[in-house]
């Protein structure tokens, strides 16, 4: 039975040209995290494998930085970066947990962070 929950940074906004940290946290489970995938729609941005460490997809190497922790930092944001981002926790023995973050990249200087929320 999967008992864990993923807490994410929820709906967030950031300024064009700036950077943003995408964060997810898996709690309420003793399952071992074997890998975390970060995806944007159907594109793989990065993985963090428990044995091997981080790998950033070549097409995102210039604008994506690993961390802090299992999070992901997006840099030099453009309006095209607006959209859904997913953290996918592969765990043993529970299986897969997925968290969703919606990022809006704004032209203006008004960019406020949304509240945290949980996905069971």
């Amino acid at each position: 039975m999967m008992t864990g929950t993923i807490e994410t940074t929820g709906n967030i906004s950031a300024e064009k040209g700036g950077s943003i940290i995408l964060q997810c946290h898996l709690s309420s489970t003793t399952a071992q995290v074997t890998q975390v995938n970060w995806e944007q729609q159907d594109q793989l941005l990065a993985i963090c494998n428990a044995d091997l460490g981080w790998h950033i997809s070549p097409s995102f190497k210039d604008r994506v930085a690993p961390g802090p922790g299992l999070g992901l930092t997006l840099q030099s944001l453009t309006v095209n970066d607006t959209g859904e981002y997913f953290c996918i926790y592969h765990t043993y023995p529970d299986g897969t947990y997925t968290g969703r973050i919606f990022l809006e990249v704004l032209e203006s200087s008004v960019a406020e962070h949304g509240a945290r929320f949980q996905i069971p």
């Epitope: 074997t34 428990a50 044995d51 091997l52 460490g53 981080w54 950033i56 961390g67 922790g69 299992l70």
Partner: antibody, heavy 122, light 112 residues
Framework: EVQLVESGGGLVQPGGSLRLSCAAS????????MNWVRQAPGKGLEWVSY????????YYADSVKGRFTISRDNAKNSLYLQMNSLRAEDTAVYYC???????????????WGQGTMVTVSS | DIVMTQSPDSLAVSLGERATINCKSS????????????LAWYQQKPGQPPKLLIY???TRESGVPDRFSGSGSGTDFTLTISSLQAEDVAVYYC????????FGGGTKVEIK
């Protein structure tokens, strides 16, 4: 005694194929992620490929992607590396290496085989 | 990929003296969530496979003599052999695993 023993190396022409094997003993093989690491003559070490204990996760270095295939048979306590479209720059000693997992993942290789030499030459 | 740069390429040290090997990574290998540096040191003697000496930058692997010690954090690391013994003649490699594994070019330690 914990041991890894590689075999299957040899001389092969460019474009040819070779299958390396690594026989494991002295530990619960299926519980450990395994790797192939190579060392060209007189050179340093290069990580080649990784496979998780259940074979569910596999990765390759860019230099071998699309040409090499890693696999394992936990029932036989064996690790394999199928090498196709071999090039002169693949000439190296190939080591199988185990991931250290004694406490929490250190991402280091704690047990290495003695290596098997692969020579790609016409 | 993270580039690991070792210095010096070779080192000649008298028996009983200290040997110091440096390793620099092109990016930090410090993982913030557990405060671990994903940096390992290996010893490779002629005709033998590498042997793990140190992981997490400073933790000695079981059975490794205490004359071997590792230090450093972030991007700069050091392996020290406090009192060189004849059996320590080897090539020493650092390896990062913050990103997928890469190794330094090696440092050859000889007796002066």
């Amino acid at each position: 005694e914990v041991q890894l023993v590689e075999s299957g190396g040899g001389l092969v022409q460019p474009g040819g194929s070779l299958r390396l094997s690594c026989a494991a003993s002295g530990f619960t093989f299926s519980s450990y992620s395994m790797n192939w690491v190579r060392q060209a003559p007189g050179k340093g070490l290069e990580w080649v490929s990784y496979i998780s204990g259940s074979s569910s996760t596999i990765y390759y270095a860019d230099s071998v992607k699309g040409r090499f295939t890693i696999s394992r048979d936990n029932a036989k306590n064996s690790l394999y590396l199928q090498m196709n479209s071999l090039r002169a720059e693949d000439t190296a000693v190939y080591y199988c290496a185990r991931h250290r997992i004694a406490d929490s993942p250190s991402r280091a290789f704690d047990i290495w085989g003695q290596g098997t030499m692969v020579t790609v030459s016409s | 990929d993270i580039v690991m740069t070792q210095s010096p390429d070779s080192l000649a040290v008298s028996l009983g003296e200290r040997a110091t090997i440096n390793c620099k990574s092109s990016q930090s290998v410090l993982f913030s969530s557990n405060n671990k540096n994903y940096l390992a040191w290996y010893q490779q003697k002629p005709g033998q496979p590498p042997k793990l000496l140190i992981y997490w930058a400073s933790t000695r692997e079981s059975g490794v003599p205490d004359r071997f010690s590792g230090s450093g954090s972030g991007t700069d690391f050091t392996l020290t052999i406090s009192s060189l013994q004849a059996e320590d003649v080897a090539v020493y490699y650092c390896q990062q695993s913050y990103f997928f594994p890469t190794f330094g070019g090696g440092t050859k330690v000889e007796i002066k």
